[in-house]
């Protein structure tokens, strides 16, 4: 009788676990595990997790609250969502603004920072994709302006500005020389 | 073989302290929940202080609460027990006994040491 | 607390009869989870430490002769002694195991005739 014995609970249901002398019941989410039961198979204290504290499983055995994150003003994340006894804060960007992770396997809880969205707008282009998880996607030049080089350039007002082949099929006219 | 080994016992004055000692051997003791249980000098026999294995949980009946501490040293398989503020009614013979970890029966127990409490 | 009564405090019996001895608790000792009744039964002999005789009730210790028998479920509790030996003179002492604060019966005292 003196070797190593693995703690048993013989109780029915899942959710029970060693805790103490006794197999105890685990906490509801949101709550942290104040006393465990004094008796087999029998529900813990379990207290609501204190402000800025969290517990997201249920049937947990956790004898204190995670504390909740705080959205890195450094970065430009902001909260999305504010943490509660169940949940952690959800941070994230604000509108117009994107998600830059700063490691390249990006996960939901890798670091990242914001970046403000590109302005398609700004320059003259159509907006292809809206900036969300990356930076907006810029299509074509806007109606009245035409490629050149990396950026859309306004058609000439006047027949005295220079209109090269891509500016005439845009713009609709060819400077006579 | 399980041994189970008591010390510390002594006579004390009201109001004073002590405290028991109870080496263990023979067993993987970190793995086991202990108790002290004493036996009053007309044969009642009395839970007094419980301790678990692993992150230790501790419990007491009212009649003691606030006065006894149980501890354990795992490196010294040692069980303990503070008794502080002792009255006339604390005399009795100690003993450590071991849990069975399933059902909290004690398997096993030591030999016991005596305490008197007099002025 | 659970309350635990035992009875007789004392009895004396010639060797080889059948003894009883009862123990009754405030409130059920039976786990609805696993059926189990956190009841032992403790032997106490002159000038030694208590020893496990039974668990959950029923259940005897390795090492104890199968003349100690126990049973019961619930509130109510037995201790029987088949045919009683000059050894078995002692102090039987049940213990709720049950619930903190663990409690004891006052005992009964076994002489021999």
């Known amino acids: 009788q003196g070797g190593t014995r693995s703690p048993r609970c013989d109780c029915a249901g899942d959710f029970h676990k060693k805790i103490g002398l006794f197999c105890c019941r685990g906490c509801p989410a949101g709550h942290y595990l104040k006393a465990p039961c004094t008796e087999p198979c029998g529900n813990s204290t379990c207290l609501v997790c204190p402000q800025d504290t969290f517990l997201a499983w249920e049937n947990h055995h956790n004898s204190e609250c995670a504390r909740c994150q705080a959205c890195d003003e450094q970065a430009s994340q902001v909260a999305l969502e504010n943490c509660s006894a169940v949940a952690d804060t959800r941070c994230g960007c604000k509108p117009g603004w994107f998600v830059e992770c700063q490691v390249s396997q990006c996960v939901s809880s890798s670091p990242f920072y914001c970046q403000p969205c590109l302005d398609c707008g700004a320059l003259h282009r159509h907006t292809r994709l809206l900036c969300s998880r990356r930076d907006t996607d810029c299509g074509t030049c806007l109606p009245g302006f035409y490629e050149h080089g990396d950026g859309c350039v306004s058609c000439p007002t006047s027949t005295l500005g220079s209109c090269p082949e891509r500016c005439a099929a845009v713009c609709g006219w060819r400077q006579m020389f | 073989e399980v041994q189970l080994v008591e010390s510390g016992g002594d006579f004390v004055k009201p109001g004073g302290s002590l405290k028991l000692s109870c080496a263990a051997s023979?067993?993987?003791?970190?793995?086991?929940?202990m108790s002290w249980v004493r036996q009053t000098p007309d044969k009642r026999l009395e839970w007094v202080a419980a301790?678990?294995?692993?992150?230790?949980?501790?419990y007491y009946p009212d009649t003691v609460k606030g006065r006894f501490t149980i501890s354990r040293d795992n490196a010294k398989n040692t069980l303990y027990l503070h008794m502080s503020s002792l009255k006339s009614e604390d005399t009795a013979m100690y003993y450590c006994?071991?849990?069975?970890?399933?059902?909290?029966?004690?398997?096993?127990w030591g030999q016991g040491t005596t305490l008197t409490v007099s002025s | 607390d659970i309350v635990m009564t035992q009875s007789p405090s004392s009895l004396a019996m010639s060797l080889g009869q059948r003894v009883t001895m009862n123990c009754k608790s405030s409130?059920?000792?039976?786990?609805?989870?696993?059926?189990?009744?956190?009841l032992a039964w403790y032997q106490q002999k002159p000038g030694q430490s208590p020893k496990l005789l039974v668990y959950?009730?029923?259940s005897r210790e390795s090492g104890v002769p199968d003349r100690f028998i126990g049973s019961g479920s619930g509130t109510d509790f037995t201790l029987t002694i088949s045919s009683v030996q000059a050894e078995d003179l002692a102090d039987y002492f049940c213990?709720?195991?049950?619930?903190?604060?663990?409690?004891f019966g006052s005992g009964t005292k076994l002489e021999i005739k």
């Open positions: 023979g067993f993987t003791f970190n793995n086991y929940g």
């Open positions: 301790i678990s294995s692993g992150v230790t949980y501790t």
């Open positions: 006994g071991r849990h069975d970890d399933y059902g909290n029966h004690f398997d096993y």
């Open positions: 959950f009730a029923s």
């Open positions: 213990q709720q195991h049950y619930s903190t604060p663990f409690t």
């Open positions: 409130q059920s000792l039976l786990n609805s989870h696993n059926q189990k009744n956190y």
